[in-house]
């Protein structure tokens, strides 16, 4: 057992069938001695009395809110969460498993440039009753400092019969190096609680792993002259860090219908211009990279070639 | 070239030689990009190898202010990759595939290292950690980390060099 | 299967014209841009221009504006090259490529030698 | 108009070889360069796109790497059906332009 924040503690537990629970101490925090009380949630069912109640923690009717009382009235709380470890893993019943990358990627995260600050989010099916609590660090063994928000929910979608919820957090590393080669990676944790089961989600990563520019802006087309040729020039993002001489990003200019099968005129350049040959109906598109590590690709940034 | 004394270097191919090092070293091995090595225990493999750090003067300001301290950063840093390319890590069992750009890439790291600091003029080199694997299989992890940290490194050159082609050539 | 048929062989004196077709056959003919490529005797490749089935547009290179023409007929599938004003230099194999892409050639005809003599 | 000059012209190689074959370009093309092998009498056949980028079909002996100006096609273990002339193509900026091709002999 062990205290996730004041008054709520966290009770580990392997998970099998007749599986013989954890014993648990609870301790009135009170000077009284004599005549105190245990409940269970909004029970009256008198569990023990004395300063300490001993129980046998085997599964989720265990756990909740225990209260010791005297004289009708409450001395203290303690809530009893469940961490279930199943076959040596610990439970991911909370999160929904988003598969990119990677298989059992519950977290995903994303910088717009390298000052420091990223965004992570995850997925969930359950839509009541869900707290979560986001720490994070550079760095474990002698963790610098990482300061993240509270997450909120950032969307929900209908999937087939079921609704998604996404929940996403913005953190800021302290002191953020800019332009440093990372050593340490950045570790996120996300403490996940549902009714009364605790889970725990982590994840690892360097900031130049997770870059995924903005868009390019500005996107302008310039017919030429006697040409089926088109000038299109656009500018850097501007949450892209800076200066661009310094943190540059290289660009892929694509023209193309509707439809993906359709065919199309594709240019990769270091510029902020390409010519490209723009077709009716057609629509000319950019997207930024940055220039000499291999992240992700921004969206793209579209105007229509008429 | 940059010397000792603090003459500049040829800022222009110093950045034409480390894009082309990225380029060789994510070619090297792409799929190196999606796998999660910090699983496996970096720590005693892949912390002793140079790190640009904060203080190296290899930011924008840094490098206005007397770019010698980051130009010796980074040749301490290709001295060392180059090296560790042409260790037993690289070479021995199993071995790279004839057309692996490991080669090129040794190569490339040695052309900007003399570019940086031509000979008689010598800056303090990092010592090379006794890193040899018994196991095929740990060296290939090995191969692994070291170039995707290899690919941190370089990308953070070619920032200074086309930063310094940019506004710092004469 | 993508593929690209050629017309046969062509002798013609100089100052006269050829054209030359270009049969594409297992896909969709205006899905892809046709280019034409000439192959002088033991010599590299020269791009000449390409054309968008789909409507026509055409664009050349520079060194063979007014000397080219491309078209395509949508209702047999077919690509055409026709040179003017033939000299002996214009002696050559001639490609027709396409691609779903513009700027490379993902798929080949056989070639079709042209050759200019009195 | 963007110049392509491929070298060697030609070389000599035996069958398992390693051979490569560079291309530079006049200006920066960034990756827009793509390789061609042609052997006599025969079309062209496209072997790698974008610099690097495989084509399905072609064997994995063919890579290419580069950016900007200089690039480089590389024949793992040389087959003897890999005998042939190999050619680079810029897609920068039209016109689009040829390398003067390398003939890879049997030596």
């Known amino acids: 057992i062990w205290e996730l924040k004041k008054d709520v503690y966290v009770v580990e537990l392997d998970w099998y069938p007749d599986a013989p629970g954890e014993m648990v101490v609870l301790t009135c925090d009170t000077p009284e001695e004599d005549g105190i009380t245990w409940t269970l949630d909004q029970s009256s069912e008198v569990l023990g009395s004395g300063k300490t109640l001993t129980i046998q923690v085997k599964e989720f009717g265990d756990a909740g809110q225990y209260t010791c009382h005297k004289g009708g009235e409450v001395l203290s709380h303690s809530l009893l969460l469940l961490h279930k470890k199943e076959d040596g893993i610990w439970s991911t019943d909370i999160l929904k498993d988003q598969k990119e990358p990677k298989n059992k990627t519950f977290l995903r995260c994303e910088a717009k440039n390298y000052s420091g600050r990223f965004t992570c989010w995850w997925l969930t099916t359950i839509s009541t009753d869900l707290t979560f609590s986001v720490k994070s660090s550079r760095g474990s063994s002698d963790p610098q400092g990482v300061t993240c928000g509270a997450a909120t929910l950032s969307a929900e979608r209908v999937r087939g019969d079921n609704k998604e919820y996404e929940y996403s957090v913005e953190c800021q590393e302290d002191s953020a190096c800019p332009a440093a080669e990372e050593s340490l990676p950045i570790e996120v944790m996300v403490d996940a609680v549902h009714k009364l089961k605790y889970e725990n989600y982590t994840s690892s990563f360097f900031i130049r792993d997770i870059i995924k520019p903005d868009p390019p802006k500005n996107l302008q087309l310039k017919p030429l002259k006697n040409s089926r040729q088109v000038e299109v020039s656009w500018e850097y993002p501007d949450t892209w860090s800076t200066p661009h001489s310094y943190f540059s990003l290289t660009f892929c200019v694509q023209v193309q219908g509707k439809s993906k099968r359709e065919k199309k005129d594709r240019v990769f350049t270091d510029k902020t211009s390409a010519t490209v040959i723009c077709r009716k109906n057609a629509s000319i598109s950019v997207r930024a990279q940055d220039r000499y590590y291999s992240s992700s690709w921004s969206e793209w940034a579209s105007v229509p070639c008429s | 070239r940059a010397v000792p004394g603090g003459s500049s270097p040829a800022w222009t191919q110093c950045q034409q030689l480390s894009q082309k090092l990225c380029t060789l070293a994510w070619s090297a091995h792409p799929l190196v990009g999606h796998m999660d090595l910090r699983e496996e225990g970096d720590e005693e493999t892949t912390n002793d190898v140079p790190h640009i750090q904060c203080g190296d003067g290899c930011d924008p300001q840094g490098l206005r202010d007397n770019s010698q301290f980051c130009l010796q950063r980074i040749h301490q840093g290709l001295i060392f990759y180059e090296k560790l390319l042409g260790s037993d890590i690289f070479t021995g069992e199993p071995s790279l595939l004839p057309d692996s750009p490991v080669g090129q890439l040794h190569a490339s790291l040695l052309g900007l290292s003399q570019l940086l600091q031509p000979e008689g003029h010598h800056w303090e080199t990092q010592q090379i950690p006794s890193l040899s694997p018994s196991q095929p299989w740990q060296r290939l992890l090995l191969r692994f980390k070291i170039l995707r940290s290899l690919q941190a490194f370089v990308a953070v050159a070619a920032r200074v060099f086309a930063h310094g082609a940019a506004t710092l050539s004469p | 299967e993508v593929q690209l048929v050629q017309s046969g062989a062509e002798v013609k004196k100089p100052g006269a014209t050829v054209k030359i077709s270009c049969k594409a056959s297992?896909?969709?003919?205006?899905?892809?841009?046709l280019h034409w490529v000439r192959q002088r005797p033991e010599k590299g490749l020269e791009w000449m221009g390409w054309?968008?089935?789909?409507?026509?547009?055409?664009e050349y290179a520079p060194k063979f504006q007014g000397k080219v023409t491309i078209t395509a007929d949508t209702s047999t599938d077919t690509g055409y090259l026709e040179l003017s004003s033939l000299r002996s230099e214009d002696t050559a194999v001639y490609y027709c490529?396409?691609?779903?892409?513009?700027?490379?050639?993902?798929?080949w005809g056989q070639g079709t030698l042209v050759t200019v003599s009195s | 108009d963007i110049q392509m000059t491929q070298s060697p012209s030609s070389v000599s190689a035996s069958v398992g070889d390693r051979v490569t074959i560079t291309c530079r370009a006049s200006?920066?093309?960034?990756?827009?360069l793509h390789w061609y092998q042609q052997k006599p009498g025969k079309a062209p056949k496209l072997l790698i796109k974008?610099?690097?980028q495989s084509i399905s079909g072609v064997p994995s002996r063919f890579s290419g790497s580069g950016s900007g100006t200089d690039f480089s096609l590389t024949i793992n273990s040389l087959q003897p059906e890999d005998f042939a002339t190999y050619y680079c193509?810029?897609?920068?900026?039209?016109?689009?332009?040829f390398g003067g091709g390398t003939k890879v002999e049997i030596k």
């Open positions: 490529a396409a691609n779903k892409e513009l700027r490379y050639f993902d798929v």
């Open positions: 297992g896909y969709t003919f205006s899905d892809y841009y």
């Open positions: 054309i968008d089935p789909e409507n026509g547009d055409t």
């Open positions: 200006q920066s093309i960034s990756i827009n």
């Open positions: 974008f610099a690097s």
């Open positions: 193509q810029q897609s920068n900026s039209f016109p689009l332009t």
